[in-house]
Amino acid sequence: MKVLQEPTCVSDYMSISTCEWKMGGPTNCSAELRLLYQLVFQSSETHTCVPENNGGVGCVCHLLMDDVVSMDNYTLDLWAGQQLLWKGSFKPSEHVKPRAPGNLTVHTNVSDTVLLTWSNPYPPDNYLYNDLTYAVNIWNENDLADSRIHNVTYLKPTLRIPASTLKSGISYRARVRAWAQHYNTTWSEWSPSTKWYNSYREPFEQR
């Protein structure tokens, strides 16, 4: 049994880190493999993660960590029974992938404006709470070429767009993702999308 693509890990900088890797052939990840992880300091406790399959040769493991802090560094050991397949280390604060924003809502009752709001995925006591910026993707359900990205570089999780910039009588969808500036993180996953109908009509004299 061989590792084809070594584990790569990302952390939500709270309590969960996710590691993914590929095996040399079809593998029942949960039955055949274990990923052991241990905080690098004195004789810290060793934890075990049971991986799940992620495609035919892919495995994924969700490592539960006790409140990740900047100093933490973990050793990772991938085992197949008594055989050590791979050994590595992982510093969560250097490989941050933020949690996805949630509760994306579209408010169309404000005349001439579409207001999108969403929730910051972090609590205020987490550093990332005040470090996130967002990208909002809006697209026409009937014409995927009619798609745009709005970068939200201010802290407030809201976006206002003039309804006139969207086609009238069309259903649109939106989704949002986040990244943290200071940590130069990867982008989060996209939030679930939300749908609305753009019923805006130009005033008669502008037609």
Epitope: D67, V69, S70, N73, E94, D125, H182
Partner: antibody, heavy 121, light 107 residues
Amino acid sequence: QVQLQESGGGLVQPGGSLRLSCAASGFTFSSYSLTWVRQAPGKGLEWVSTIKARGGTTLYADSVKDRFTISRDNAKNTLYLLMNSLKPEDTAVYYCAKPLYNNFAGDFGSWGQGTTVTVSS
Amino acid sequence: DIQMTQSPSSLSASLGDRVTITCQASQSISSYLAWYQQKPGQAPKLLIYGGSRLQTGVPSRFSGSGSGTSFTLTISGLETEDLATYYCLQDYSWPLTFGQGTKVELK
């Protein structure tokens, strides 16, 4: 505002024990890692121990490992340091400290006023 | 363990002077460095975190710079209330380690 109040210091003989307490208020106690830092007379600051927010991870300086035990009671908003087998070199002012953010465990934005521990025969 | 070496261990300066204190790490700590001020009989006070971020309420005459292994705390114009001992702290890896301190006195 955040308040940290240490207590439990005093004079103790070598080999003796003490339990320090740090009563906290003004923040969500259970969300933060908390730390003890000490300062021997006329000396610099020394990290002693940290306990993570949920209490499952405790970390110690080599100089106190196996003698000191850090713990917390999230229901009582109190941090503890049980010090056994005390040595004269443990004589210091002991501070409890809270970080600015729960994932920046070393950036201590709040400190107690300190409690003095003297180990002497 | 990461060793933090501060220099100088003490310095004398006049009011209004620009004061610079350096902290050297024995290995790279990225930007995980904080600066503290301590006055006699008082608890330390956080000035700078993340290498260069000014803690709320700290006067803007204090600034921090550097990354990797070399860091600097600068006081752009020394005032009476700045006479104190300054410590750096690395929070890049366990165990947390402080510099030995720099005492700033009046010339």
